[in-house]
Interface confidence: low
Amino acid sequence: AGVFELQIHSFGPGPGPGAPRSPCSARGPCRLFFRVCLKPGLSEEAAESPCALGAALSARGPVYTEQPEAPAPDLPLPNGLLQVPFRDAWPGTFSLIIETWREELGDQIGGPAWSLLARVTRRRRLAAGGPWARDIQRAGAWELRFSYRARCELLAVGTACTRLCRPRSAPSRCGPGLRPCAPLEDECEAPPVCRAGCSLEHGFCEQPGECRCLEGWTGPLCTVPASTSSCLGLRGPSSATTGCLVPGPGPCDGNPCANGGSCSETPGSFECTCPRGFYGLRCEVSGVTCADGPCFNGGLCVGGADPDSAYICHCPPGFQGSNCEKRVDRCSLQPCRNGGLCLDLGHALRCRCRAGFAGPRCEHNLDDCAGRACANGGTCVEGGGAHRCSCALGFGGRDCRERADPCAARPCAHGGRCYAHFSGLVCACAPGYMGSRCEFPVHPDGVSALPAAPPGLRPGDPQRYL
């Protein structure tokens, strides 16, 4: 269980000529609100497929009225986070759709009218519990800046919020509503308690007692805008109540990605996701065909079926992107069981197992037999997270504590009679047969089917099975 959180920092006209002056139509004032939709996986899903991971609506933003001849400002936004709770595991890979809706407040018959102003789709990988990820997206003539994160709630921990933890003070048994109980961690990996007063909206902490600020904010409690000048012009709302919501200049400012590429900020740099037909650091290389070898990492290039895509790259396992330029984070699928650490070595996945577990995916529990004695000389056999006893002759049951009748299975062949013996069983063979189970016929000339009868035993003597 957990919650996905989205913070819209700014929505306004994008850079460049031809940007709209106002989101409102000529009919009068309007206000904005946002709809966020989460879909699982990274596939190009149809726009109308459902928000299977969840969805949420923002509140309405303040009413905006265009001022004639005034410079186009960023638009007043709704306050607060958009939160999308999720009940099951956080999938790690997901599609994020953010829709900006305009509510026109003019004199329409029947009340307000709504129209979709911009729609941004972003396919991302995101581990729960990580820091805020920041993004800037262009949608037509509009530009949207936002941050998002996924965090676990209740007693869930881990990058997928699938492990349940138990606070140190809690009893060892599962409380009501905790399903499934296993595997319970020894203690909760609760998020650290930040410095008292640290802004919930603009600050975060990775160690107890600290207060680290999101870009654009400063001060010991992250309550002071880093630069009031960043609240001016085209880059975000400024008000006495909300302060400046906009981060300072970032690598994606001005959108360095050409040809419709979308920019994502990475630590100290940026990354362009290019549309088909373009590649390069800034999506600046165009007019590409298969002859140019645009598919990286061994991707197979085939000519595109339509003029807009001169080629298509079929990527080998472990790579993705329109040019197979991105390595798939195969560890995000959490293949290592029982808390094992996943290592993506490129050519293979490796799981580093916790003590007591083994196997390629840490699936074998080595402690199955620990502290479980098998009685009466039985030996413990491991497997599948449970122990099994292989019992000595004459004993059976889960722990070899039950006496078993060795003759119950009628082990003596050809009419031989079975006698229980302290070390097993003895077969008294019918005339004409010999062997420990009376399995060998004695030939008419007195020679058995065996190479020789054991010394001291005549054909027909009772054979003791040792």
Epitope: E48, P50, L57
Partner: nanobody
Framework: EVQLAESGGGLVQAGGSLRLSCTAS????????MGWFRQAPGKEREGISC????????YTADSVKGRFTISRDNAKNTLYLQMNSLKPEDTAMYYC???????????????????WGQGTQVTVSS
């Protein structure tokens, strides 16, 4: 998998009441405009009531106004239609539907709706 499942239909005498439910799975109705439609044998499917996700406004067709009430419980992911003072002409198969657009369209067209249930039969005897 996306599913809308209607329930609550049945046989009722004229003047009686029924409450239809429509439970969604695979998506969240909170951000969908939800509507009730009905289709009588030999007739086209008609919209009878709708609740928008923008503003939560509700609309009801004139033919059932004052008798039918639409409501939703987002926490339970369920849409309801309370039907009172039922008439024989209300006999039809009743369907619930969902669409992503924030408002109910004025023409009650079913074409904009993306997800449909299988329907529940309502029969009103005289």
């Amino acid at each position: 998998e996306v599913q809308l499942a209607e329930s609550g239909g049945g046989l009722v005498q004229a003047g009686g009441s029924l409450r239809l439910s429509c439970t969604a799975s695979g998506f969240t109705i909170a951000v969908y405009t939800m509507g009730w439609f009905r289709q009588a044998p030999g007739k086209e499917r008609e919209g009878i009531s709708c609740t928008s996700w923008a503003g939560g406004r509700t609309y009801t067709a004139d033919s059932v106004k004052g008798r039918f009430t639409i409501s939703r419980d987002n926490a339970k992911n369920t849409l309801y239609l309370q039907m009172n003072s039922l008439k024989p002409e209300d006999t039809a198969m009743y369907y619930c539907a969902a669409k992503a657009h924030p408002d109910c369209s004025g023409d009650w067209s079913p074409s904009g709706y993306e997800y449909w249930g299988q329907g529940t039969q309502v029969t009103v005897s005289s």
